[in-house]
Amino acid sequence: LPTSQGVDHKQVQRELGNAVLHLHNPTVLSSSSIEVHWTVDQQSQYIQGYKILYRPSGANHGESDWLVFEVRTPAKNSVVIPDLRKGVNYEIKARPFFNEFQGADSEIKFAKTLEEAPSAPPQGVTVSKNDGNGTAILVSWQPPPEDTQNGMVQEYKVWCLGNETRYHINKTVDGSTFSVVIPFLVPGIRYSVEVAASTGAGSGVKSEPQFIQLDAHGNPVSPEDQVSLAQQISDVVKQP
């Protein structure tokens, strides 16, 4: 290969300009890797390698800087880009280079890494009495941290679990909703409430249980006064 010493720079630029890259549709290999293929219209001695440029695309990512993966083997026409974010749509392009000189960009192609279930729970889960005189509670939360969502959050699952299955209540809301009202809680039953985000790959990590128990008037019982039904029964049994 020629070096930049004693090389006609105009010739380098001209040859790099003629070396048009055609990017094929990328192949998604996993939740964190994408394989990129390309062909060169006109091979040249003045191609030292290829720069594969990629970045997350979409409204919520803005115009982020291009990340660069260098391929320093001119004969090579494919590469696997590793360490990508899960469930993220990427725009990808390629360009040839020779030392500090760079050729024209290929067309841009798009590929989305595979989603995984979120690896962190929703944040800031709160459980409170809902307005009104019924036995309903309001469960609120914030999404998991963005880098743990591992894709687009499609829905949130809420589990409101009493001490027996007949007291269980499950709710599902869409991914843009961050609260849900759960009606008809049974007074005197201690419920644990958990929330998890779900992507297309499934349900993620559940939040730490939050406990709530309503008294006969439908008002929350303070945590130190919360006693399970089983405990109440066992206390009665222990009485002489």
Epitope: I169, N170, T172, P187
Partner: antibody, heavy 115, light 106 residues
């Protein structure tokens, strides 16, 4: 909960009625069926868990009613077989979260006449 | 569990206080719900867990009782309350209903 229209059927025949759910997540609630007849008031037929198709029947309706769901269309179905005049009634679908919770929404009812 | 509504029909005037009773054949704790069936057949939940008012139900409706004896009260009867009222227990399978009390105008 939107139920299918009235049915006039012959004795010995079968009939399948539907209940289409909208406005909530279909798999979050048990779907129940209730019979309203002049002689016997309201009778709970049974329920189905849309998520997995699990059913629980009132013993009195075992062999008479079969409950199914189609998750893709958020629709519950009840088939009644070997119909007799005793089966002439209004049939309601109704939802609840679990057994101790009330039926908070009901369909408008489907009238079945066996004649 | 058998649910008994002893009064099958009840006549009252607009503005009256009306009480409908329901008895369970065994202790059902507070797992007692009341439903209203209008003449056109539509059914609505009124009261759950004996005394809790379902959202959107007028405050003239109230419920009370525990164990085996329960009642539904309408403090001031209005025209739109003319309907049949059913109690239902949620304590034990199979779920069972009372025979209904039909409320009519005098």
């Amino acid at each position: 909960l939107q139920q299918s229209g009235p049915e006039l059927v012959k004795p010995g025949a079968s009939v399948k009625i539907s209940c289409k759910a909208s406005g909530y997540t279909f798999t979050d609630y048990y779907m129940n069926w209730v019979k309203l007849s002049h002689g016997k008031s309201l009778e709970w037929i049974g329920d189905i868990v849309p998520n997995n198709g699990d059913t629980t029947y009132n013993q009195n309706f075992r062999g008479k009613a079969t409950l199914t769901v189609d998750k893709s269309s958020s629709t519950a179905y009840m088939e009644l077989r070997s119909l007799t005049s005793e089966d002439s009634a209004v049939y309601y679908c109704a939802r609840f979260s679990n057994y101790v919770y009330p039926f908070d929404y009901w369909g408008q009812g489907t009238t079945i006449t066996v004649s | 569990i058998q649910m008994t509504q002893t009064t099958s029909s009840l006549s009252a005037s607009l503005g009256d206080r009306v009480t409908i009773s329901c008895r369970a054949s065994q202790d059902i704790s507070n797992f007692l719900n009341w439903y209203q069936q209008k003449p056109d057949g539509t059914v609505k939940l009124l009261i759950y867990y004996t005394s809790r008012l379902h959202s959107g139900v007028p405050s003239r409706f109230s419920g009370s009782g525990s164990g085996t004896d329960f009642s539904l009260t309408i403090s001031k009867l209005e025209q739109e309350d003319i309907a049949t009222y059913f109690c239902q227990q949620g304590n034990t399978l199979p779920l069972t209903f009372g025979a209904g009390t039909k409320l009519e105008l005098k």
